[in-house]
Each structure stands twice: as C-alpha cells, then as structure tokens.
C-alpha cells in the first residue's frame, strides 16, 4: 500500500506480508528519509486495537501508549530509521497478530501513511524420504508445521498431470501447542529413475519438496514461498 | 537496582518433578522477557526456553518441550520453571536471565544466581 | 539446530586488547542474529556484556564493545584488566532460538 496524507504529504510504502507464529516476523514500511533521526516519528497502529502498536521517535523507543499484547515483542530497526526504514520486527508472531496495520510517519518534511495486511499462520518446509519400512516402494513426505490446514499434492515429471490421490494417503497430527499441525504424506507405488514432488499449501504459503531416485543415489531439493505478499 | 533472586539448591530423586523461581525486582516485570538457561560441566550454556510474563508468551528449545514449563505470577513478579520426570541428565544449575527486546537495546543483562539440581536416587 | 563455535581459550596481559569472536555453522553472523557476549565468573556470577551485536548495558565498561568481523560476532577488550579473567559466553538467536558457544576463558597474566 502506498500512502499520502496531509498538505505536506510524504509517501509511505508497505508490503502486504505473512508471519510464521513462534518465530519473528517483520512488517515491511519504507517512507522518504529526513536528514535528523530526532525529527522522524514511526507509529505502528493495528485495526481494532485501542493502543499503539510501536512508537519511535527522537531516536528511541516510546512505548508508554504501547497495547498490552504487544509489549515485549516490538521493535524498529533504529540504525536503518534514517535512511528510511521503519519495518517493525515483532517477536514470537501470534496467532492473533493478523490484521490490518497502520505505518504513519512523521518527519520535518511532512506526514504520511500506508495500511498492510499482515496473515498469520504456520508453514514449514517438507522433506521427503524413502520409506524404508514400507512393502513397496514408498516416499513420505514430513513438514513439522502447518496453520492452517492445508492441502497436499503430489506429482511426477513423468507422469504429468498424473492423480496420485489414490494412491497416497496423507494425514495431520496437532502439534503440542494445539495449534500447528506436523503434515504427513505417503506416496505408494513409486518407480525409480523419477522425480517426484510433494507440495504443501495453505493460503499462506507453499511449499515443495522434490525427490529423485535412481539406483545409485537419491536427490532432494525443496524450496518455500510464501503467498500474496505484494508491494503496492 | 534490577535484580533476579532464584530459589535454593535442590535434591531431588529420578522420576519426580521440581519448581524453580526467579524473583525479579527493580524493574517492570511484565515487560521484560524471561530466558532459562540450563549449565552442566562441560556442556557449556544451553537455553532452555522463554517467557513474556506480561502475556504469558512462551517459546521452548524443542529438545526441552516435554521437560519443562514455564509461568509467571506477575502480582509477585516470579517467574517459574517446572521440570518434569527428572534424571541424573537434569542434573545441572539453571538460571534465569532477564532479556530486554527493544530498538536500540536488546539484550541480557540481568542474570539470577543459579539453582543448583541434583537428581540421585 | 545450529552450532556456535568460540575460541576455546586466550591468553592476553593487562592494557592489551584482546578480540573473541563466535562462528555460526549456518553462514555469516548478522545483526539479525541479536549477538550477546556474556561474561562468567567463579561462584555462578554472570554479566551481559553486549547485546544486538553492539549494544552495551548500563553499567559495562567502555572497554568492552561488539561487532562483526568478517563473518564472525566479535567481543573486543581494549586495555584488558586483571578482573576481566573470566569466561566469556556469545549467544545468537536464529529466528525463533538462541545458541550459546562452547565459551572461551580468558586469562590475564600478571
């Protein structure tokens, strides 16, 4: 979201972003950069919360209308405040942190904000494994963390566009914090000398895990990208 | 003066279950994280997990989920650590450490005196 | 899970300075990894030294001060003194985690 605001409007850009809850997160906030960090105001809002989110200005934090859910896990990166970066860092992301916020700056040459929309969730990415155990050649496929539930798929470079539904089975089992999920996936019947793929995906993120099998070795490659986080 | 007080030297046999406290004082409690940190000889630090007693926010090292809990009772301003099914690997000084997460500060700069457990039948 | 690796021990003389530096198996340390460098002395007695790489807490001297090097977290002590033999621990925090190094002991002669 881009954001101008006031007779002497500066721009304010933000990036629609996603939180992995437990770990840090950021939500991104750029603005034009003042020549004096003591002139520059950052204040951190969120939709439907009465307090500030993070304020930070004449250099340091001010955090005495700071909202309880958010003391403790909030902070700017205050050597990059001067070249224009107001992006809040946010400690162990919640659950309840999704929302709408709001980056409203103030310098010496004027005032502006932008909204973004910040998800929450969980995603993690998958490996996958020969199932050594099985009867027949089988791959599984593990991802520690999902929220929400998501969908799982399988593919093959030789068999594309193939239904592997039938054939795989996939379940969900509640982490101990109840709420993330550990994400199991079996796949039966499987042929070397193929690349097989196991993809995750919620409406946070999505997740690959390929694996290669040949007589010889076996190859594995995975890779996670998180959804909608857009720039505008 | 911000201080951490932790509770007394404990005995305790395998199998059962021990309470650690820190006391904190001199600051605002609830707003301060509050790191466990588990010492054996030769073993160096490992951290155990965290806790935000202002909301109850915890976070544990996955090798210490089903070992330990922590809570915190902010109208006495102490924080606690339970450790469960202990064994002689339990055996250790634990301590707590205040974790201040800030801007232009973030660090641990406040650390308890220790709790030294010893699991023996 | 990460490993962090100190130096395991140095020797140093008072009014030298002295740099201990802590490696992540992961890559480069950054200022993301929050770098704390923790002091130990006898009797369970321990000190934040620096926090966020090179934020000092009310109280430390001047001569201890953080930063990166190369790729590396590094403590230096400039004008060490006789009381700074101790153990000195770093800690960096891997998004949701922290790491504490083997520890590095720190003697001064004289």
């Known amino acids: 979201d881009i954001g101008i605001s006031g007779r002497h409007s500066i721009t304010v850009t933000t990036v629609a972003s996603a939180g992995n809850i437990g770990e840090d997160g950021i939500l991104s906030c750029t603005f034009e950069p003042d020549i004096k960090l003591s002139d520059i105001v950052i204040q951190w809002l969120k939709e439907g919360v009465l307090g500030l989110v993070h304020e930070f200005k004449e250099g340091k934090d001010e955090l005495s209308e700071q909202d309880e859910m958010f003391r403790g896990r909030t902070a700017v990166f205050a050597d990059q405040v001067i070249v224009g970066n107001a992006s809040l860092r946010l400690k162990n992301v919640q659950l309840t942190d999704a929302g709408t916020y709001k980056c409203y700056i103030i310098t010496s040459k004027g005032k502006g904000n932008a909204n973004l929309e910040y998800k929450t969730g969980a995603f993690s990415m998958p490996e996958v494994n020969v199932d050594y155990n099985a009867s027949s050649e089988t791959l599984r496929c593990e991802a520690p963390r999902w929220f929400p539930q998501p969908t799982v798929v399988w593919a093959s470079q030789v068999d594309q566009g193939a239904n592997f539904s039938e054939v795989s089975n996939t379940s969900f089992e509640l982490n101990s914090e109840n709420v993330t999920m550990k994400v199991v996936s079996v796949l039966y019947n499987v042929t070397i000398n193929n690349t097989y793929s196991c993809m995750i995906e919620n409406d946070i993120a999505k997740a690959t895990g390929d694996i290669k099998v040949t007589e010889s070795e076996i190859k594995r490659r995975s890779h996670l990208q998180l959804l909608n986080s857009k720039a505008s | 003066q911000v201080q951490l007080q932790q509770s007394g030297a404990e005995l305790m046999k395998p199998g059962a279950s021990v309470k650690i406290s820190c006391k904190a004082t001199?600051?605002?409690?609830?707003?301060?994280?509050i790191e466990w940190v588990k010492q054996r000889p030769g073993h160096g630090l490992e951290w155990i997990g965290e806790?935000?007693?202002?909301?109850?926010?915890?976070k544990y090292n996955e090798k210490f989920k089903t070992k330990a809990t922590f809570t915190a009772d902010t109208s006495s301003n102490t924080a606690y650590m339970q450790l469960s099914s202990l064994t002689s690997e339990d055996s250790a000084v634990y301590y707590c450490?205040?974790?201040?997460?800030?801007?232009?500060?973030?660090?641990?700069?406040?650390w308890g005196q220790g709790t030294t457990l010893t699991v023996s039948s | 899970q990460a490993v962090v690796t100190q130096e395991s021990a140095l020797t140093t003389s008072p009014g030298e300075t002295v740099t201990l530096t802590c490696r992540s198996s992961?890559?480069?340390?950054?200022?993301?990894?929050?770098a704390n460098w923790v002091q130990e002395k006898p009797d369970h007695l321990f000190t934040g030294l620096i926090g966020?790489?090179?934020n000092r807490p009310p109280g430390v001297p001047a001569r201890f001060s953080g930063s990166l090097i190369g790729d590396k977290a590094a403590l230096t002590i400039t004008g060490t003194q006789t009381e700074d033999e101790a153990i000195y621990f770093c800690?960096?925090?891997?998004?949701?985690?922290?790491?504490f190094g083997g520890g590095t002991k720190l003697t001064v002669l004289g």
């Open positions: 966020g790489t090179d």
């Open positions: 806790i935000l007693p202002g909301s109850g926010i915890t």
């Open positions: 992961t890559g480069a340390v950054t200022t993301s990894n929050y």
């Open positions: 450490a205040r974790y201040y997460f800030g801007s232009v500060n973030f660090y641990f700069d406040c």
């Open positions: 800690a960096l925090w891997y998004s949701n985690h922290w790491v």
């Open positions: 001199g600051y605002t409690f609830s707003s301060y994280w």
